[in-house]
């Protein structure tokens, strides 16, 4: 009986693909075929695992047992898993690690461990039989205390490594360094004692390197006790860390060992300070090194209307090609800042505050002189005409996105940077368009907005994107006689000819589903016959139902069928 | 059109507690910040504290941390401030603003009226 | 915390003629170029209205009679021509640093 109730909550399609999480399970079912290729068991209530109950299932390749609250696995359970490529075991109760179970995984390549009460990672090493793993995730967040010199010995390359040290007391030094290569390390540590000693295994075979949810606010660099400068890390992520002027001071010192760091990414960080980076020996210049890209994200900076002057960063920004700098609360970018940003090709300040009249301070002349990518997406810029008028000083602006600001009226005419070249002012409230867009441009996307009418003459416009508004045809292909891509779904068509498509010469792609089709004879004869059409319309058939007449709404374009009578009246 | 409206007058005892709202309409509630201004009868605006519904954060006047707080239901564009240990000295116009550009409180609310008094 | 002075306390005016406000502030207001300075009139029972931003941005509706000046710590809120709708209360308010403070005000009365 129990049996069957397990079986209950489990589904499997043709392909052997078994799906039985969030039930009641409390062991692994036992009635099912050897053709299972895949078993999604988590959030159950198995807590036991012995060496017969997966036996049969010799194609397994997908184990998923995360969140049950397994306690004991019996050294053989996995002996018959040779095919198993992906092993999920996180947030179990597994406090010891044996290196057993996972000797017979000879196909592993996704092992997750993360979330087990273990101190350690065994006695042996538990991975130097797995030589195709390349997903590994161990650590938790109390009692894993230990990294040990053999935990991970045998493994040559991981695309990703996922350690969870938030209560690291021990690091036993060159435990990481065994591991060749890394492409992206995740480290989770709440102190910062032992970062540098990890720090100095990891230089030369990680790209990618990530710390989490860190204290760094009494963070102090030493001079790292290693005579290596061939690194290999070129991306470093600070996530949910905190940080204060002064440690962010020694964090740059740090970074500056990395001759090959080309990307910086802090998010979800918060800075305790007011902006005086200068550090206590501020006799020493940092040197930004080859850092072209720099990406922060919801940055939360408690004294942030108490900042001082920015200008001990400014000289660290003179290579930066591209900032993101999103959902920080950015108001104003100093126009001293602006102006040291010489190299600076890319710059997104998305969910901001920005307005044009602070703008203007930030886009001073001179500022941004490389500039050719602007995004100002959900910023607080309400003047089309105004946005564009602060932009002119930007020459070689060619990439504007303004969308999700509020403009509602559109003016006759405005003035933009001359080379511009794509435009973004989807979700803006505008009800109509005028000659304020550019005739420069190439891509423009006005959709969801409230227009009904689209007649601009855009000489050189390849792609339109003008999706959910509330047009009611195609526009004058006339006006557009480079388009390349029209995107005109969710609106108010009701019909379209093979007249209307021939007259876009050059169009290649047309998206118009989800409008409201009058499925009249001659638009489902046209649409029926003409088989070259599914090339264009990227959406057909799927998107394409009728409105009416009412007997056949809702119904796909391509199915429909009316009666003679109908169609002869 | 952006409005910001605020609930009905309040009549409280000292030691009670009062809470205000005030909901918004006319542009997208969690790109703005919304702060609360006071205003005794006769006198100057006091400024209370603002939030981001965007994602919570809050920041206060320290004459008001103990006792003032602001929550926000995004799903009805609806910000609140409570404030506890009412005293006759709370009596007051109390105002909802809208924040823009950071810096700038560019809609009020038409304002709350508390009064407190035994 | 910042603190504002306005002054004139009141100012009495006859339609026509041109108001000078004050307002100085305890510290510079200034932010990397931008002061942040704002100016709100208030008329009786009414919630104040936004006039100026950063010193010298007028918000939009508002007539051009109305111009800011100043930075660091003196600002100017003119009107070039007093009108009978001008009356009220008129307060600067500093968003340098926190907390945000507003001046006392100056009262506009029309003789």
């Known amino acids: 009986k129990e049996e069957s109730s397990n079986q209950a909550s489990l589904s499997c399609d043709h392909n052997g693909i078994c799906k039985g999480s969030s039930g009641s399970l409390n062991s692994i079912p036992s009635g099912l075929t050897e053709a299972v290729k895949s078993l999604d068991l988590s959030n159950n209530r198995i807590t036991y695992i012995s060496n017969s109950d997966l036996q049969r299932y010799v194609n397994l390749q997908a184990l998923v047992l995360t969140s049950n609250g397994i306690n004991t696995i019996e050294e053989d359970s996995f002996s018959s898993l040779g095919r198993l490529e992906h092993l999920d075991l996180s947030y179990n109760y597994l406090s010891n690690l044996s290196s057993s179970w996972f000797k017979p995984l000879s196909s592993l390549k996704f092992l997750n461990l993360l979330g087990n009460p273990y101190k350690t990672l065994g006695e042996t090493s538990l991975f130097s039989h797995l030589t195709k793993l390349r997903i590994l995730r161990v650590g938790n967040m109390d009692t894993f205390t230990k990294i040990q010199r053999k935990d991970f010995a045998g493994l040559t390359f991981l695309e990703e490594l996922e350690i969870d040290a938030s209560d690291l007391q021990s690091y036993e030094p060159k435990s990481l360094k065994s591991i060749q290569n890394v492409s992206h390390l995740i480290l989770h540590m709440k102190q910062h004692i032992l970062l540098l000693e990890i720090f100095v295994d990891l230089t030369s075979s990680v790209e990618c390197l990530e710390l989490r949810d860190t204290d760094l606010d009494t963070f102090h660099f030493s001079e790292l006790s290693t005579g290596e400068t061939n690194s290999l890390i070129k991306k470093f992520t600070f996530r949910n860390v905190k940080i204060t002027d002064e440690s962010l001071f020694q964090v740059m010192k740090l970074l500056s060992q990395i001759s090959g760091l080309l990307e910086l990414e802090f998010d979800d960080c918060t800075l305790n300070g007011v902006g005086d980076f200068r550090g206590s020996d501020n006799d020493r210049v940092i040197d930004p090194g080859k850092v072209e890209t720099v990406t922060i994200r919801r940055l939360h900076i408690p004294q942030f209307y108490s900042f001082n002057d920015l200008s001990t960063l400014y000289p660290l920004t003179e290579r930066v090609k591209r900032i993101t700098v999103e959902n920080s609360k950015v108001f104003l970018v100093p126009c001293l800042l602006s102006r040291h940003l010489k190299s600076l090709e890319y710059l997104d300040l998305s969910e901001n505050l920005m307005v044009e009249e602070y703008l203007k301070n930030s886009a001073c002349e001179d500022a941004w002189p490389s500039l050719q990518t602007l995004i100002l997406r959900q910023n607080h810029l309400a003047s089309l005409g105004k946005t564009g008028e602060t932009l002119l000083t930007l020459k070689n602006l060619t990439n504007l996105d303004i969308s999700k600001n509020t403009f509602h009226y559109m003016p006759e005419t405005c003035q933009w940077p001359e080379k511009m070249k794509y435009l973004n002012l989807s979700s803006t409230r505008i009800h109509s368009v005028t000659g304020c867009i550019p005739k420069t441009l190439e891509i423009l996307d006005i959709s969801n907005n409230n227009l009904n009418l689209f007649s601009l003459n855009l000489p050189q416009l390849k792609e339109l994107y003008i999706s959910r508004n509330k047009l009611m045809t195609l526009p004058d292909a006339s006006l557009l006689p480079m388009l390349l891509v029209l995107k005109i779904s969710r609106n108010t068509i009701t019909t379209f000819s093979k007249e209307q498509l021939d007259s876009f010469h050059t169009l290649k792609t047309l998206e118009a589903g989800g409008n409201n089709f009058i499925c009249s004879c001659e638009f489902l004869s046209f649409t029926q016959e003409q088989q070259a059409l599914a090339k264009v319309l990227v959406d057909w058939p799927a998107n394409y139902l009728c409105d009416s007449p009412s007997h056949v709404r809702g119904q796909r374009v391509q199915d429909v069928r009316l009666s003679v009578s109908e169609c002869h009246r | 059109q952006v409005q910001l409206v605020q609930s009905g007058s309040e009549l409280k005892k000292p030691g009670a507690s009062v809470k205000l709202s005030c909901k918004a309409s006319?542009?997208?509630?969690?790109?703005?910040?919304i702060n609360w201004v006071r205003q005794a009868p006769g006198q100057g605006l006091e400024w209370i504290g603002w939030?981001?519904?965007?994602?919570?954060?809050?920041n206060f006047n320290e004459n008001f941390k103990d006792r003032a707080t602001i929550t926000v239901d995004t799903s009805a564009s609806t910000a609140y401030m409570e404030l506890s240990s009412l005293r006759s000295e709370d009596t007051a116009v109390y105002f909802c603003?809208?924040?823009?550009?950071?810096?700038?409180?560019?809609?009020w609310g038409q304002g709350t009226t508390v009064t407190v008094s035994s | 915390d910042i603190v504002l002075t306005q002054s004139p306390a009141t100012l009495s005016l006859s339609p026509g003629e041109r108001a000078t406000l004050s307002c100085r502030a305890s510290?510079?207001?200034?932010?990397?170029?931008?002061?942040?300075m704002q100016w709100y009139q208030q008329k009786p029972g009414q919630p104040p209205k936004l006039l100026i931003f950063?010193?010298?941005n007028v918000e939009s509706g508002v007539p051009d009679r109305f111009s800011g000046s100043g930075s660091g710590t003196d600002f100017t809120l003119k009107i070039s021509r007093v009108e009978a709708e001008d009356v009220g209360m008129y307060f600067c308010?500093?968003?340098?640093?926190?907390?945000?403070?507003f001046g006392g005000g100056t009262k506009v009365e029309i003789k």
């Open positions: 603003a809208r924040l823009t550009g950071g810096t700038f409180l560019d809609y």
């Open positions: 006319g542009f997208t509630f969690t790109t703005y910040g």
């Open positions: 939030i981001y519904p965007r994602d919570g954060s809050t």
């Open positions: 510290e510079s207001v200034e932010y990397y170029g931008t002061s942040l």
């Open positions: 950063g010193a010298s």
């Open positions: 308010q500093q968003s340098r640093k926190l907390p945000w403070t």
